[in-house]
Interface confidence: low
């Protein structure tokens, strides 16, 4: 509204008059009139400072658009009627505090607040940076920002933060890694971090195992396994204690017996070999290396079951050039043997009775030449021969030829045999079996108690001229020993040979009865004696043990025996008791 | 919180060379394994590189002698220099982290064109 | 190198219907402090690959329980409960227990 002019006050006191001046004007009395002055914070609308136009108006004046503003730097200004008001953005702060207006005392000026000098402003496990008007906080190394914390950082979960072989032990803030036993660092130092040292295993197999073992080195470890044949004290197979020993183990002493029956254990240091008992050889499907070493019964003899027990006719099959001395033994020997080897050819070999035995032949023609050798060199001859008619003979009823012959007669030899396959069926039945003019009788019992496996079979041999080379003076009394100025003895019969499959060869509960042929009629005053060849003397001998006489006539002899085996009878004349 | 962002793709010329960035927040380089897989275009992922906690360095066979991981603990910034650039090292490559248990924390990937 | 087989590499399933994924190592995943460092990851189209699993059976943080982790030695499955909309994408296993890292080929699961 436009205020009325009015006349002054000529008395000097205009100001009384409150409508003068407009608001937030102050009005001031002059000598003879007065004027009107807007307030501090306000501007008069004509722009002059003192004014009595009633149409002049006092306006604010804002103090905070004014440039630079009147707070200063880092603050924030508020305009208000007549004035303003001062207060310091948030991080920073004045001496005279906030909401400064002009007239309170002191300087309003707004600094940073160190807010890390407040301990709790940042949390556990970080770092506070100040900055101007702010701050922050950043996680100390091992540490990781998770929902305003600071959270431990497990290093040990990273596949890699240490090297194989160590341990990672979490720490706060932190971690190490320690190499496991048996490891060393290759830094030298006990704990490490990362990947720069590495966990190098230690050898302990330099001096921990004892003799006879084997150390094998493990990571971070070592055992000690005793060698093959040797077994440890603390009876652990595989040991790391420093006192146990490794002993050898006596493979023989086993029960049953490592090598299995029929066989012959040698121990040795660590070791052991197997071998068989006679009549027995090393089944060749097995073997002691593979653990499966068995013996199996010879069926029949061959060139390497004859060998072993006699040393001349090893030196025959040396390889080496044979000693002149022994070139005709050898001649002999080697004419037997390579009979025998075609019969031992291999196990499909079909053996004809008649052939082989016709083979025999030669041999027997040049008996006669034996008598220029030593007495150990016919009758190692002689147990061959006599050993490898009998193998022949076993061997045709091993692998018999398509047309069996049950009876080879020749000029030097006879031989007749029988396989067993009905014949034995009812009881108390006895065999009889004839070779030249000298026969064999023997009971089914006997034949069963041998104890054959598969095809049973007998047979009986007799020998023209053998007795000629065999003679007297081969004979061996095993109850006494005889010297010739009290007798004379002479033998007097072609030697026989009584063959059968079985395994048993003496020992019979029933006798087997030979009746031998005499080559010259028997006088009064002899006396026969039944012979058995034994291979147990010397390359081998005559002796009476296992036969009695049954029977004694002019033209033949009935021997008792109880055994299988070749024989002959030698008479004896002058003072010879015999029971 | 945790944020991996990579940077310094482009197109370049076969033989050329290039440098990817991939700068590290909310955690130290020194507490995890930081690797680079990459995806060349229709194809599965390829890992490439890695500079383990400790500092040591492995790499693909593909990129062995040619490529070098490499970090600045102080700008926690890991770094995969590029070398003797072939056709087939086009792909997105992402920065990732062993973070407590595997890649958990990847970059958004930056695309790397090798072309004439 | 560990080569990782996965299989099948495409996956078609109804929602709601079960899935799994198989993944064969060609070596023993198993590190020698013990762990046996086996993930598997998800990268949805235009994402970068997020972890499901890590150590064979372990859910990473914010993963639904339907998703469950197996296996041992070289032979490892993945398995989904129930598979919903959102779980289309390739999904990735990798070895970190030997240096260098391998992945899988990757499996396209895709709703039918």
């Known amino acids: 509204h436009i205020r009325p002019t009015r006349k002054p006050n000529t008395k000097g006191n205009n100001c009384r008059d409150s409508t003068l001046c407009p608001a937030y004007a102050t009005c001031t009395n002059t000598v003879d009139s007065y004027y009107c002055a807007c307030k501090q914070g306000f501007l008069s609308s004509n722009g002059q400072n003192h004014f009595k136009d009633p149409g002049v108006r006092c306006k604010d004046i804002d103090e905070c658009s004014q440039s630079p503003q009147p707070c200063g730097p880092n603050s924030s200004c508020k305009n208000l009627s007549g004035r303003y008001k001062c207060s310091c953005l948030d991080g920073f702060s004045s001496p005279t505090g906030n909401d400064w207006v002009p007239g309170k005392p002191g300087n309003f000026s707004c600094t940073d607040i160190n807010e890390c000098l407040t301990s709790s402003v940042c949390p556990e496990h970080s770092d506070c940076v100040n900055s101007m008007g702010s701050y922050s906080c950043s996680c100390q190394v091992g540490f990781i920002s998770r929902n305003s914390t600071c959270e431990d950082v497990d290093e040990c979960a990273d596949p890699r933060a240490c090297p194989e072989h160590a341990t990672c032990n979490n720490t706060v803030g932190n971690y190490s890694c320690f190499c496991n036993p048996g490891f060393e660092s290759s830094s030298g130092h006990l704990s490490f971090q990362g990947l720069k040292a590495s966990c190098e295993d230690i050898d302990e197999c330099t001096e921990m195992c004892p003799i006879n073992s084997t150390c094998t080195n493990t990571p971070g470890s070592y055992f000690c396994t005793c060698h093959p044949g040797f077994a440890p004290s603390n009876g652990q197979l595989n040991f790391t204690d420093q006192g146990v020993e490794c002993r050898d183990i006596d493979e023989c002493r086993q029960d049953p017996s490592t090598c299995g029956p029929n066989s012959i254990c040698t121990n040795a240091l660590g070791s052991y070999s197997c071998g068989c008992i006679a009549g027995f050889h090393p089944n060749p499907e097995g073997s002691q290396k593979d653990g499966n070493f068995s013996c199996q019964r010879v069926l029949f003899k061959c060139k390497e079951d004859v060998i072993p027990d006699n040393k001349q006719i090893q030196q025959c099959q040396e390889g080496t050039a044979v000693k002149p001395a022994y070139v005709s033994f050898c001649a002999q020997i080697n004419n037997i043997f390579s009979v025998l080897d075609k019969v031992c050819e291999n196990k499909t070999t079909v053996v004809s009775l008649k052939n082989t035995t016709e083979s025999f032949v030669p041999v027997l023609k040049q008996i006669s030449t034996w008598t220029k050798f030593t007495k150990e060199e016919t009758s190692s001859l002689a147990t061959v021969f006599l050993e490898s008619v009998e193998s022949m003979t076993l061997a045709s009823f091993w692998k018999p030829s398509a047309n069996i012959t049950p009876a080879v007669r020749t000029e030097y030899l006879d031989i007749e045999s029988k396989v067993i396959n009905k014949e034995c069926s009812e009881e108390n039945v006895t065999l009889d079996l004839v070779a030249k003019g000298d026969k064999m009788k023997i009971g089914c019992s006997t034949i069963e108690e041998s104890e054959s496996t598969e095809t049973t079979g007998v047979a009986f041999v007799s020998f023209v001229g053998m007795e000629s080379v065999l003679n007297e003076r081969f004979f061996k009394d095993h109850q006494a020993p005889l010297t010739t100025s009290e007798i004379k003895l002479k033998m007097n019969s072609r030697v026989v040979g009584g063959i059968m499959t079985g395994e048993k060869k003496d020992g019979f509960s029933d006798p087997i009865i030979y009746t031998l042929e005499n080559i010259q009629p028997k006088q009064k005053f002899e006396r026969p004696i039944c012979v058995s060849w034994s291979t147990d003397v010397k390359g081998g001998r005559w002796t009476s043990f296992g036969c009695v006489i049954l029977e004694a006539s002019e033209t033949y002899t009935i021997c008792s025996c109880n055994q299988m085996a070749n024989l002959a009878v030698i008479m004896a004349s002058g003072e010879l008791t015999m029971d | 919180q945790v944020q991996l962002v990579e940077s310094g793709g482009g197109v370049v010329q076969p033989g050329r060379s290039l440098r990817l960035s991939c700068a590290v927040s909310?955690?130290?380089?020194?507490?995890?394994?930081m690797h680079w897989v990459r995806q060349a275009p229709g194809k599965g992922l390829e890992w490439v590189a890695v500079?383990?906690?400790?500092?040591?360095?492995y790499y693909a066979d593909s990129v062995k002698g040619r490529f070098t991981i490499s970090r600045d603990n102080s700008k926690n910034t890991v770094y995969l220099q590029m070398n003797s650039l072939r056709a087939e090292d086009t792909a997105v490559y992402y920065c990732?982290?062993?973070?407590?248990?595997?890649?958990?924390?990847w970059g958004q990937g930056t695309t790397v064109t090798v072309s004439s | 190198d560990i080569v990782m087989t996965q299989s099948p590499l495409s996956l078609p399933v109804t929602p709601g219907e079960p899935a799994s994924i198989s993944c064969r190592s060609s070596?023993?995943?198993?590190?020698?402090?013990?762990?046996?460092?086996l993930e598997w990851y998800l990268q949805k189209p235009g994402q970068s690959p997020q972890l499901l699993i890590y150590?064979?059976?372990n859910r990473a943080s914010g993963v639904p329980d339907r998703f469950s982790g197996s296996g041992s030695g070289t032979d490892f499955t993945l398995k989904i409960s129930r598979v919903e909309a959102e779980d289309v994408g390739v999904y990735y296993c990798?070895?970190?227990?030997?240096?260098?890292?391998?992945f899988g080929q990757g499996t396209r699961l895709e709703i039918k």
């Open positions: 990798v070895q970190g227990t030997h240096v260098p890292l391998t």
């Open positions: 070596q023993s995943l198993v590190h020698s402090n013990g762990n046996t460092y």
């Open positions: 990732a982290s062993i973070y407590y248990r595997g890649f958990d924390v």
């Open positions: 500079i383990w906690s400790g500092g040591s360095t």
């Open positions: 150590r064979v059976s």
């Open positions: 909310g955690f130290s380089l020194t507490s995890f394994g």
